[in-house]
């Protein structure tokens, strides 16, 4: 039998600093959580106590703080590379400054190979990017060999900004082959590395012949076995069985997210590389692990620019953005709309011809609008300024829901209003009105969303039946502000872009903005 | 204060096995990897093997596989080592050891094993 | 496996003297990720287990006395005791701390006149 270690990260995001226990920016040091420097920590002591150990990152290491905004991915190589990472799957984030924004910072720079089977290039891309990523990679581990095999999520399109010459194909379709091909070059021991979900890592388990193992990302899907050891709830056992088609018994893990776990897995296979037994866990990464002090030295380097960055004109506003929560949890506000504006632009994606965009609508809770922002300091906006209105580090995600569902939220939006409290919605491409003598649950007497399928866009009765895409906070999308029929009745989720970054690349590209209070959310009396 | 407490000096007949215990206190037990080393009389130090005490994953010197199997007990925080088949070329101060994050952090007192007849 | 190789073997000198030991390994311990050789010296006083002095190649132990100096890079290190006091008489391993299987050089025995 034949022993192999494999350490594994997934939708890191941005997070090379430790961060508090929820993942966002850390406050008391001896109660921190994660970051490249206590990783790296972890993964030496692993290294020099154990003999075949590969450390593997499922995708998704851009995108989700000030690090991203500034260093546009050049801090992932230089991280990755000093924590001598063996392989790396593309991520949907990993595109999000489109092709050159991966080709140039990561990918020509990463002494580690990066992959994708179902990613294919073509046009001019094809010569300009071969090599640098890779459908398969066999590596030496020991005395023997171990082939890792790369997938993407085909709805990376949708998600982020991958151009017109990368076609993303179906993830099974497309390992099935590069997994037959490692075999007939005699390797016998296969992990499939990517970032489509639990959910499809399941299916490549249960389908691709010849996978092993399955090591995934993108959903930030938690398994434990036994007592977890922080907040997360195990969405099942550590590693999770799935039966193949062929009868194997194939593990797949996923290590949560934001580096505050290093996923642990002990495979041991036969001579014929079939696995006899696997077994682990992720390891909490806090703050009994010490930060290695020279990684850490390099990280608070790399920090001084961060710090420039924040005080730095992104651009003006020439009317008062107001933040205010006596104007946002009560009625429409232009900060909403502003916040609402620039999720709707930072996810224009133009796949289909039938469609203006796939997605019109945003919804925003605003109990999360924190602060305003006065345009009589000169109307400059910083990022420092946007972190005091968007403090909490979230992302804005992309959901699908039933029209019914969407109802259901708005009129939670109002089910008490008049207390001041967070969950009154601020919308992008919705107009509803409320009737507030109604009783509560029945208050919502209009809601029209403007049309996708369409060539000039306008404005629709929602139709209950109907599965819309909607843009909004991932605190909405996991039921806070008690938004449960969000997180119960959503029928997909992907996680997007961090908040600060969306809102500052939108007031960058606009240059001066103006937002304004535009009947977005009504009010009416009586009978329409 | 991190102690290792190792069983007391061992005098067994050749062909019997032996296990000697390594009671840790003063850290987090599971935190870190134990590891045990072989020195015979005027000699060097030989690493034999290690375990992970959250798991009971073992990894072993090649040249003491068959000869040493190791074992924790997480409830009573204890490492022990047995040997088998045992030879006088296995008469030695045997050591517990865990190593931290840098190095071989404590070590235990030492057992001294002799095989005689 | 990294092979560890110290010398010499053993060296008897006289209190307040400067006392140098070698160590080379077969295989660079210096990690590119954090640039730290990983390369550990231990102290075994007679009827002791071995006593970390030195971590990381260079990086003195807490409450070592600084006497004891480490230093060397890749496969090429070197243990100075700038004036050998009689409590100094032991016996100094290396160690490859940099990756598995851990390994010992054979050990440089200090003897005071």
């Known amino acids: 039998a034949w022993e192999l270690t494999i350490l594994h990260t997934n939708d890191v995001h941005s997070r090379l600093e430790q961060t508090s226990e929820d993942s966002s920016k850390c406050v008391n040091a001896s109660r921190c959580m994660g970051g490249v420097a206590r990783l790296f920590t972890k993964v030496q002591q692993i290294r020099r106590a154990e003999p075949n150990v590969l450390l593997l990152d499922a995708g998704d290491q851009y995108q989700g703080t000030i690090w991203f905004t500034v260093y546009k991915g050049a801090e992932v190589a230089h991280f990755m590379n000093a924590l001598r990472y063996d392989a790396m799957a593309l991520g949907n984030h990993e595109f999000d400054n489109g092709v050159e924004g991966l080709i140039e910072p990561l990918l020509k720079e990463a002494k580690f190979p990066i992959l994708s089977a179902n990613i294919k290039a073509k046009g001019p891309l094809a010569s300009q990017i071969s090599g640098l990523y890779l459908p398969y990679k066999v590596l030496p581990v020991g005395d023997e060999v171990v082939g890792i095999v790369g997938y993407t999520s085909k709805e990376t399109p949708f998600l982020s900004n991958p151009g017109t010459n990368l076609v993303f194909e179906d993830e099974i379709t497309a390992l099935q082959p590069e997994v037959d091909k490692l075999k007939t070059l005699n390797v016998n021991k296969i992990i499939a590395l990517g970032h489509s979900g639990f959910e499809m890592d399941k299916l490549i388990a249960q389908k691709v012949r010849g996978v092993d193992v399955v090591v995934g990302g993108h959903s930030n899907t938690f398994l434990y076995t036994g007592n977890p050891p922080s907040k997360e709830v195990p969405a099942g056992k550590y590693p999770f069985i799935v039966t193949s088609d062929d009868g194997r018994k194939v593990p797949v893990v996923q290590a949560y997210a934001f580096g505050k776990y290093l996923g642990y897995l002990k495979i041991e296979f036969d001579e014929r590389g079939n696995v006899i037994s696997s077994h682990g866990n992720p390891i909490l990464l806090n703050s009994s692990i010490p930060e290695d002090p020279s990684i850490k030295a390099d990280i608070n380097k790399w920090r001084i620019k961060l710090d420039n960055y924040s005080t730095q004109e992104l651009g003006k506003t020439i009317v008062y953005l107001d933040g205010s929560s006596q104007s946002c949890r009560f009625r429409e506000c232009n900060m909403g709309n502003l916040i609402c504006d620039a999720m709707i632009n930072n996810n224009l994606r133009h796949t289909d011809e039938m469609f203006w965009n796939h997605v019109s609508m945003c919804i925003l809770n605003g109990g999360g609008i924190r602060s305003p922002i006065d345009e009589r300091n000169n109307g400059t906006i910083t990022w420092e300024n946007l972190a005091a209105v968007l403090p909490f580090g979230g992302t804005f995600d992309l959901v699908q829901l039933k029209g019914s569902t969407l109802k259901k939220a708005f009129e939670h939006s109002v089910h008490r209003y008049g207390q001041s409290t967070g969950e009154f919605l601020q919308v992008g491409g919705i107009h509803v009105v409320y009737d507030l003598s109604r009783k509560p649950g029945d208050r919502v007497v209009k809601l029209d969303v403007l049309c996708t399928k369409c060539r000039v866009p306008s404005y629709d009765p929602l139709k209950m039946d109907e599965v819309y895409k909607v843009i909004l906070p991932n605190f909405l999308a996991n039921g806070g502000d008690g938004f449960q029929m969000i997180k119960d009745e959503l029928l997909r989720h992907d996680s997007g872009d961090q908040d600060i970054n969306v809102v500052s690349t939108y007031i960058s590209k606009m240059k001066v903005i103006y937002p304004a209070v535009e009947g977005r959310i009504k009010f009416s009396t009586g009978s329409h | 204060e991190v102690q290792l407490q190792q069983s007391g000096p061992e005098l067994v007949k050749p062909g019997a096995s032996v296990k000697i215990s390594c009671k840790a206190s003063?850290?987090?037990?599971?935190?870190?990897?134990m590891n045990w080393v072989k020195q015979s009389h005027g000699k060097s130090l030989e690493w034999i093997g290690n375990?992970?005490?959250?798991?009971?994953?073992?990894n072993y010197n090649q040249k003491f596989k068959g000869k040493a199997t190791l074992t924790v007990d997480k409830s009573s925080s204890t490492a022990s080592m047995e040997l088998r088949s045992l030879t006088s070329e296995d008469s030695a101060v045997y050591y517990c050891?865990?190593?931290?994050?840098?190095?071989?952090?404590?070590w235990g007192q030492g057992t001294t094993l002799t095989v005689s007849s | 496996d990294i092979v560890m190789t110290q010398s010499p073997s053993s060296l008897t000198v006289t209190a307040g003297e400067k006392v140098t030991m070698s160590c080379k390994s077969s295989q660079s311990l210096l990690n590119s990720g954090n640039q730290k050789n990983y390369l550990t010296w231990y102290q075994q006083k007679p009827g002791q287990p071995p006593k970390v002095l030195i971590y990381w190649a260079s990086t003195r132990e807490s409450g070592v006395p600084d006497r004891f100096t480490g230093s060397g890079s890749g496969t090429d290190f070197t243990l100075t005791i700038s004036s050998v006091q009689a409590e100094d008489l032991a016996v100094y391993y290396c160690q490859n701390d940099y990756s598995y299987p851990p390994t010992f050089g054979g050990g440089t025995n200090l003897e005071i006149k």
């Open positions: 375990i992970n005490p959250n798991n009971g994953d073992t």
């Open positions: 003063g850290y987090t037990f599971t935190d870190y990897y």
């Open positions: 050891a865990n190593s931290g994050y840098y190095y071989f952090d404590y």
